[in-house]
Amino acid sequence: SSPTSSASSFSSSAPFLASAVSAQPPLPDQCPALCECSEAARTVKCVNRNLTEVPTDLPAYVRNLFLTGNQLAVLPAGAFARRPPLAELAALNLSGSRLDEVRAGAFEHLPSLRQLDLSHNPLADLSPFAFSGSNASVSAPSPLVELILNHIVPPEDERQNRSFEGMVVAALLAGRALQGLRRLELASNHFLYLPRDVLAQLPSLRHLDLSNNSLVSLTYVSFRNLTHLESLHLEDNALKVLHNGTLAELQGLPHIRVFLDNNPWVCDCHMADMVTWLKETEVVQGKDRLTCAYPEKMRNRVLLELNSADLDCDPILPPSLQTS
């Protein structure tokens, strides 16, 4: 296999040499078969190669590793453990690699791993200890700062009996390992709800992306602990209204920007507090674009243009007056 070039261009390994190389100890900084390597950029790209496992002979210098568009299926414990360890690996992208199982300790022995992208993998089985590495009640802190888990929901027929939200949250909270996490992306996962304890245990979060899910309500979610949250993406959900408690919490976060586009806002009497808040707040990005979806008579009305007289609820008739 050809040695890595020290120029910024990528050197490729000849695939037909792979079997010969794997029969002997790997050379210190060789480039794995089917990959492209740049020592100058500290980057290895093994992209769209239908790899079924993580190459064993990754160069020790690798800082950015792209393993996207493969067919990895399972990420076992210690999938990146090497001797000597991949001490420089800071960014790992495994998106779109047909992973359906990530086992406990899959990312162990990566002391510098700051950024992990598992997006676009149908993760039917994400171990609770995938990120913490152990089942201790308090694990060693993970170095992860950015965790990208967009569109990791498997097809419905491949989901296990437990709730998908619960499986993901268990992995996020195990051993309190992700206390230093600053960016968490969970877009496009069909989340119906956000378990109430998840945010309280991720105090360092600066960016939280929950866009394109199916969240109907935030009533039981508390953002109070996310003291330095900067962006909260809630676009393209099923939110009907934000209640006073949520509004007050968001207003109390001094660095936040909230993104609320494309939700089916219900413009009835329960919307009055939110409309008042929207008129006063600066934290909502593009607030002038928010429109009513229901009731029918209010459809496409701009929330900021509503007043209290517009926001009524149909009186509930006592049972004796209800018609069958």
Epitope: V145, R206, P254, H255, R257
Partner: antibody, heavy 115, light 107 residues
Framework: EVQLVQSGAEVKKPGATVKISCKAS????????MNWVKQAPGKGLEWIGR????????NYNGKFKGRATITADTSTTTAYMELSSLRSEDSAVYFC????????WGQGTLVTVSS | DIQMTQSPSSLSASVGDRVTISCRAS??????LNWYQQKPGKAVKLLIY???RLHSGVPSRFSGSGSGTDFTFTISSLQPEDIATYFC?????????FGGGTKLEIK
């Protein structure tokens, strides 16, 4: 770690306008907020304003509103602070600082206003 | 605007000493209180945010406490490299405001 590199020192006449730049590089996890802070010679720190780089939303200290304009170019990860109608009391070092809690600071740009 | 009053304005201490600086806000700022270090000709550094959270890479001899309007910054054992000016700053209510600074010198 985030590196913030600011443009060089400027000498301006009263009434003129100065535009300082601040380029962010290095760490991938920099904040969306970029703040600007003034430090007059021998004095303390004074917050001018900030910009949320992704959508251009700004907040200003009322003392500078109308004279300070903060902008950002996301394609080059560069923020700018323009100060108009300069007067002698604007002579100071101006810092950019990245983060809600101003986690990382630039080296400062000295602006001297003198006729 | 919220006024931040820092004391003392200057302070002389010996290597190994425990040093404390106070900061008082003119109104409640919850825990949104940060501490910065400025050395001549160097970039300003964030040491502590949200009253007591240590910024990454900051030595554990630095700590902070308080809540509401009264806050304290402590260096448990002064080191020669700690000679600098220290500022408190509130980021609870716009506009953000700084204390006047405390210049720390070695005896």
């Amino acid at each position: 770690e985030v590196q913030l590199v600011q443009s060089g020192a400027e000498v301006k006449k009263p009434g003129a306008t100065v535009k300082i730049s601040c380029k962010a590089s290095g760490y991938a996890f920099s904040s969306s907020w970029m703040n600007w802070v003034k430090q007059a010679p021998g004095k303390g720190l004074e917050w001018i304003g900030r910009i949320y780089r992704e959508d251009g939303h700004t907040n200003y200290n009322g003392k500078f509103k109308g004279r300070a304009t903060i902008t950002a170019d996301t394609s080059t990860t560069t923020a700018y602070m323009e100060l108009s109608s300069l007067r002698s009391e604007d002579s100071a070092v101006y810092f950019c600082a990245n983060g809600g809690a101003m986690d990382y600071w630039g080296q400062g740009t000295l602006v001297t206003v003198s006729s | 605007d919220i006024q931040m009053t820092q004391s003392p304005s200057s302070l002389s201490a010996s290597v190994g000493d425990r040093v404390t600086i106070s900061c008082r806000a003119s109104q409640d700022i919850s825990n949104y209180l940060n501490w910065y270090q400025q050395k001549p000709g160097k970039a300003v550094k964030l040491l502590i945010y949200y009253t007591s959270r240590l910024h990454s890479g900051v030595p554990s001899r630095f700590s902070g406490s308080g809540s509401g309007t009264d806050f304290t910054f402590t260096i448990s054992s002064l080191q020669p490299e700690d000679i600098a000016t220290y500022f408190c700053q509130q980021d609870n209510t716009l506009p953000w405001t700084f204390g006047g600074g405390t210049k720390l010198e070695i005896k």
